[in-house]
Amino acid sequence: VTGSRVYPANEVTLLDSRSVQGELGWIASPLEGGWEEVSIMDEKNTPIRTYQVCNVMEPSQNNWLRTDWITREGAQRVYIEIKFTLRDCNSLPGVMGTCKETFNLYYYESDNDKERFIRENQFVKIDTIAADESFTQVDIGDRIMKLNTEIRDVGPLSKKGFYLAFQDVGACIALVSVRVFYKKCPLTVRNLAQFPDTITGADTSSLVEVRGSCVNNSEE
């Protein structure tokens, strides 16, 4: 979660909430009483922008949080990595029945990078996210977190970009990091032929045919 953000060479980041300067300013619905942007400190005394919601006492929660528009940069399949904490309902007194331990992840493809409102019916559900049994215990500044990491993928995508949305239905969640990326096959040289960076196909198993070129001082 902390330190310099180094990712594998074959991953191209489209969104990284941890590297945004200033507030994230994502769209929340309702505007108040649902998701809230909260800063916490990392061990380098710099703020981490998180989104939090914890309406575990109230029934029938339906709190939405939508990212800014994310360009897909030609990628047909993108991956969403979410680092979050999710409080065990058993540790909260008097919340049985209203407290949940999951949240929902959605996406919506759009060519419009300036959509101002969340229209729930436009979004397609990717998955229900729950806290895994395995978590990473991290010291972030002056507090300790049990951090879950979940990765989901979505595709094939066809429009210029897309929005992600998180739906809370009554859990106690802090979204600590949201990263969206696609995978590519890096530039490769084989038998004096050079093949360029290539974005992976719509499916994880898709083969993408690319034309190579001869390296310098060689010919076909």
Epitope: S39, I40, Q52, T85, S91, G141, R143, I144, C172, A174
Partner: antibody, heavy 124, light 107 residues
């Protein structure tokens, strides 16, 4: 119900040692870290540090490094504050207070339960 | 370390009046702030957490506001039970220092 019960008042001489206790009940002791706060007579509150109730690891504020020691008796759901080589300026009321051990968001990030305080008087 | 400067140090007011207590942090604490009330001889009681959220059971005449380095606690229509001392405390990197306190007295 949830409560932190502290030991009774102490009258000590300079140079002596005092150990005060804070017994937790009504919740799982290891779910919350225990913090200590000093309040000298007529003065404000001063955060002394905390102890991790899972690992027993203490963290001290700079002004409380050296003569002060936090410890636990987990089986008895009790935290302790020991002050060695007492000085007159240690005369104060000492509070224990809890906060969740793990951060799950600002909704629970504050001292929600405090002990009633233990008054320590240091006088020759 | 972050210093919390609370003002005023004391305040003499009448029942029914409105008061505002302020707390200034020496650097941005990103709303990681709580307010407590303490009566003479008692332990502090939580009033407000995360700068603006009212703790359970706290009357609605209390309200917290602020961001960055400037925070305030407002008490509308003071009641006799509101007299005592008030403290702010930050939670932005240890040590979690308190403000110097504000003593609210009956005029």
């Amino acid at each position: 119900q949830i409560q932190l019960v502290q030991s009774g008042p102490e009258l000590k001489k300079p140079g002596e040692t005092v150990k005060i206790s804070c017994k937790a009940s009504g919740y799982t002791f290891t779910d919350y870290s225990m913090h200590w706060v000093k309040q000298a007579p007529g003065k404000g509150l001063k955060w002394m540090g905390w102890i991790n109730t899972e690992t027993g690891e203490p963290t001290y504020a700079d002004d409380f490094k050296g003569r002060f020691a936090f410890s636990l008796e987990t089986s008895a759901s009790t935290a302790y504050l020991q002050i060695n080589n007492l000085k007159n300026e240690d005369t104060a009321t000492y509070f224990c207070a809890r906060i969740p051990l793990y951060y799950y968001g600002s909704r629970y990030w504050y001292f929600d339960v405090w002990g009633a305080g233990t008054t320590v008087t240091v006088s020759s | 370390d972050i210093q919390m400067t609370q003002s005023p140090a004391s305040l003499s007011v009448s029942v029914g009046e409105t008061v505002t207590i302020t707390c200034r942090a020496s650097e941005n604490i990103y709303r990681n702030l709580a307010w407590y009330q303490q009566k003479q001889g008692k332990s502090p009681q939580l009033l407000v957490y995360a700068a603006t959220n009212l703790a359970d059971g706290v009357p609605s005449r209390f309200s917290g506001s602020g961001s960055g380095t400037q925070y305030s606690l407002k008490i509308n229509s003071l009641q006799s039970e509101d007299f005592g001392s008030y403290y702010c405390q930050h939670f932005w990197g240890t040590p979690w220092t308190f403000g110097g306190g504000t003593k609210l007295e009956i005029k």
